[in-house]
């Protein structure tokens, strides 16, 4: 034991992340100690493999100790990057473990669970269209377009609640092609077109 040697301590802990599939990401970790500690990452109790183990890996252990993802990998079933991570710094005097950091993957599927259907109403009658957007994380918000332009939801006749578009009192000018739009940090998805026909 050399007098100036000391055990590791974490000086920068990783933070929770939410990242879009396919995007790069970094979980930070910095440790002090003498001798300089080695850093390893663990996810759910298992050691995370990096480019140090397999040069084809999409995860890189940076000289600072941070874990860099060239792209976040996330499939329909296999989800190797999502989870709770810790970094562990070690030297011969001991080890230090960082705080937990969760890495969540933002996704937005392609397929609408329910596409809106064509509606035919008489002038003055209420009209309702309904859609269920694709599954996503974070949960997608829903908006509507009419004839390719965002719907004017300042019109007090129009209410958007959940996946429902309600027009309490239809006018001839409400007729047109409607599309439901699901949006989150990944991007947006548009439903199939539904036609609203307003009969005189």
């Amino acid at each position: 034991l050399r007098q100036e040697d000391f055990p590791p301590r974490i000086v920068e802990h990783p933070s929770d992340l939410i990242v879009s599939k396919g995007e790069p990401a970094t979980l930070n970790c910095k440790a002090e100690g003498r001798p300089t500690p080695t850093i390893e990452w663990y996810k759910g109790g298992e050691r995370v493999e990096t480019d140090k183990d397999d040069p084809r890996s999409h995860r890189m252990l940076l000289p600072s100790g941070s874990l860099f993802f060239l792209r976040i990998v996330h499939g329909r079933k296999s989800r190797p990057d999502e989870g709770v991570y810790v970094c562990v710094a070690r030297n011969y005097l001991g080890e230090a473990v960082s705080h937990n950091a969760s890495l969540e993957v933002a996704i937005l599927r392609d397929d609408f669970r329910q596409n809106p259907s064509d509606v035919m109403v008489a002038v003055g009658e209420p009209a309702v269209m309904e859609c269920q957007p694709p599954r996503g994380h974070p949960e997608p918000t829903i908006s509507w377009k009419k004839d390719g332009s965002p719907l004017d939801d300042k019109d007090e006749r129009i209410t958007i609640r959940g996946g429902k578009l309600m027009i309490t009192y239809t006018r001839k000018s409400d007729a047109g092609k409607y599309v439901c739009v699901g949006t989150n940090m990944v991007g947006e998805r548009e439903s199939e077109v539904a036609e609203l026909t307003v009969l005189e």
């Epitope: 759910g44 298992e46 493999e49 397999d54 990998v73 499939g75 329909r76 296999s78």
Partner: antibody, heavy 118, light 105 residues
Framework: EVQLVQSGAEVKKPGASVKVSCKAS????????MHWVRQAPGQGLEWMGW????????EFPQKFQGRVTMTRDTSITTAYMDLSRLRSDDTAVYYC???????????WGQGTMVTVSS | DIVMTQSPSSLSASVGDRVTITCRAS??????LNWYQQKPGKAPKLLIY???SLQYGVPSRFSGSGSGTDFTLTISSLQPEDFATYYC???????FGGGTKVEIK
């Protein structure tokens, strides 16, 4: 190195069972689904099902339900496929394959030849 | 069940030829389509994932295209080591095409 190493060839009698193992190394075992695929002599590839090593959840096509069992031992990063009530047409090479986060089978075992003969 | 139909089932070609193999799904599978190469006595090898993405280490003469129900694998200039059997696979619910054997003319 990321690899899947399977158990050796088996010869079984009709009506018996066979258990094939697939040892994973070089990656986080619980992060990737494991599939089993078989190939009869001179034939194409046939999917037999998957196991999620994280929780042991499984799914099989109708054809194999009730006859195939898939298990895993996370402590030794090994997946197993058990096929019961063997028939001569189960003679095939059986492969384990890792499903990547890109929804494709990126790593395959070397295959295990199972011969069913009386 | 989603049925994958590959064509042709076999073809003869010469080194340097451009080779095209098609795969049709019985219903839309978006871009959940992968291509594999298999040589006798060996395990299949992933070539293309997500319809058009080239797997790490695979030569750029291999390319994939298509979405929905119709997909294509193209080998721009056939090399001696490319004589093998090729399989498409849909990962929407998982099933394989019947295979295409590429033989020397």
């Amino acid at each position: 190195e990321v690899q899947l190493v399977q158990s050796g060839a088996e010869v079984k009698k009709p009506g018996a069972s066979v258990k094939v193992s697939c040892k994973a190394s070089g990656y986080t075992f619980t992060g990737y689904y494991m599939h089993w695929v078989r190939q009869a002599p001179g034939q194409g590839l046939e999917w037999m099902g998957w196991i999620n090593p994280k929780d042991g959840d499984t799914e099989f096509p109708q054809k194999f339900q009730g006859r195939v069992t898939m298990t895993r031992d996370t402590s030794i990063t090994t997946a197993y496929m058990d096929l019961s009530r063997l028939r001569s047409d189960d003679t095939a090479v059986y492969y384990c394959a890792r499903e990547s986060g890109d929804d494709a089978f990126d790593i395959w075992g070397q295959g295990t030849m199972v011969t069913v003969s009386s | 069940d989603i049925v994958m139909t590959q064509s042709p089932s076999s073809l003869s070609a010469s080194v340097g030829d451009r080779v095209t193999i098609t795969c049709r799904a019985s219903q839309s599978i978006s871009s959940y389509l992968n291509w594999y190469q298999q040589k006798p006595g060996k395990a299949p090898k992933l070539l293309i994932y997500a319809a058009s993405s080239l797997q790490y280490g695979v030569p750029s003469r291999f390319s994939g295209s298509g979405s929905g129900t119709d997909f294509t694998l193209t080998i721009s200039s056939l090399q001696p080591e490319d004589f093998a059997t090729y399989y498409c696979q849909q990962s929407y619910s998982t099933s394989f095409g019947g295979g295409t054997k590429v033989e020397i003319k």
